[in-house]
């Protein structure tokens, strides 16, 4: 499936739209809000009852090249005594983001948008208990 | 994808940087993954730091619908099902890339935009400052 065209009645395609070859779209990868400030709480990955580690994946043919993935440290959750409680579960929280993939075909290069699923952190959940009949 | 011929000195002219503007195929790889977090899991209800999901819709953006998490409580849910204010529910935030129609309303012209979304919540121990 493709990106939906803006064909709704409240949209009129402006005259100023750049010409684009069929089956493709023009993408400016100069990022809007590139330098926005993130005001996240400190060290939540180690203070969480479902702590996680970060791994950086690097791919020079992807934009952005660097994608950070989280992995839950434990199967269970950390209790008030600092011990793992396996009656609770640490589970990953995931979010989709877009990347641009560069593909080489001989002496030509093409670009493809790709959805990537990023694990951003973990949360502690009560397990779903299935009772045997 | 749309192929762009490389420089005549092709084998030696590998450009490590991406060009500022690229033509990309309209088809998105991995497009049909589930984008509604309510359908993909019920962690938002089962978590000790549960959250509500709010729909953020913008037709000038792709994806046009993004779900934002808001923690339900200041504290976390304890074993008795009560809110414990000695622990804190905090949002897990992530910067993601989306497409912004540029110029506005144009069907096939976009610019990448970085936005900050709250994806879910996690329960943390507060930072305690000990008086010296």
């Amino acid at each position: 499936r493709k990106i939906p065209k803006v064909g709704h009645t409240f949209f009129q395609k402006p005259e100023s739209c750049p010409p684009v070859p069929g089956g493709s779209m023009k993408l400016d990868i100069g990022i809007i809000n590139e330098n926005q400030r993130v005001s996240m709480s400190r060290n939540i990955e180690s203070r969480s009852t479902s702590p996680w580690n970060y791994t950086v994946t690097w791919d020079p043919n992807r934009y952005p090249s660097e994608v950070v993935q989280a992995q839950c440290r434990n199967l269970g959750c950390i209790n008030a005594q600092g011990k793992e409680d396996i009656s609770m579960n640490s589970v990953p929280i995931q979010q989709e983001t877009l990347v641009v993939r560069r593909k080489h075909q001989g002496c030509s290069v093409s670009f493809q948008l790709e959805k990537v699923l990023v694990t951003v952190g973990c949360t502690c959940v009560t397990p779903v208990i299935h009772h045997v009949q | 994808g749309i192929t762009i011929p490389r420089n005549p000195g092709c084998p030696n002219s590998e450009d490590k940087n991406f060009p500022r503007t690229v033509m990309v195929n309209l088809n998105i790889h991995n497009r049909n993954t589930n984008t509604n977090p309510k359908r993909s899991s019920d962690y938002y209800n089962r978590s000790t730091s549960p959250w509500n999901l709010h729909r953020n819709e913008d037709p000038e953006r792709y994806p046009s619908v993004i779900w934002e998490a808001k923690c339900r409580h200041l504290g976390c849910i304890n074993a008795d099902g009560n809110v414990d204010y000695h622990m804190n529910s905090v949002p897990i935030q992530q910067e993601i890339l989306v497409l912004r129609r540029e110029p506005p309303h144009c069907p096939n012209s976009f610019r990448l935009e970085k936005i900050l979304v709250s994806v879910g919540c996690t329960c943390v121990t507060p930072i305690v400052h000990h008086v010296a």
């Epitope: 709480s41 | 204010y85 529910s89 905090v90 949002p91 943390v124 507060p126 930072i127």
Partner: nanobody
Framework: ESGGGSVQAGGSLRLSCAAS????????MGWVRQAPGKEREGVVS????????YYADSVKGRFTIAQDNAKNTMYLQMNSLKPEDTAMYYC?????????????????WGQGTQVTVSS
């Protein structure tokens, strides 16, 4: 905290919170209230190094937060009080929150001051 008490609807109160220097090292200071039988909710907060303020929709235009960094004191001016403002008001300091998000990740709680508004 101090400044709580009983007041008629439409009246005013001014709460103050003299917090430790440790609380002021956190990103935000604010007021969290808990009405009888309800949960705690962040109603107003301010950046400890100046900057953005947050007001819950229910108190916008009626409550004003201010701080005196020299005295490590924060104030909450509450005007046009309503019976639904009746609650225990806690002074709080935390790491999270901004102009659109109530204070969260709280590391410092005051002991609370009761505000009762009668109709």
């Amino acid at each position: 905290e101090s400044g709580g008490g009983s007041v008629q609807a439409g009246g005013s109160l001014r709460l103050s919170c003299a917090a430790s220097e440790y609380a002021w090292r956190l990103n935000r200071m604010g007021w969290v209230r808990q009405a009888p039988g309800k949960e705690r909710e962040g109603v107003v907060s301010i950046g400890t190094r100046g900057g953005s303020t947050y007001y819950a929709d229910s108190v916008k235009g009626r409550f004003t937060i201010a701080q005196d960094n020299a005295k490590n004191t924060m104030y909450l001016q509450m005007n046009s009080l309503k019976p639904e403002d009746t609650a225990m008001y806690y002074c709080a300091a935390g790491l999270g929150g901004d102009s659109r998000t109530p204070i969260y990740d709280i590391s410092y709680w005051g002991q609370g001051t009761q505000v009762t508004v009668s109709s």
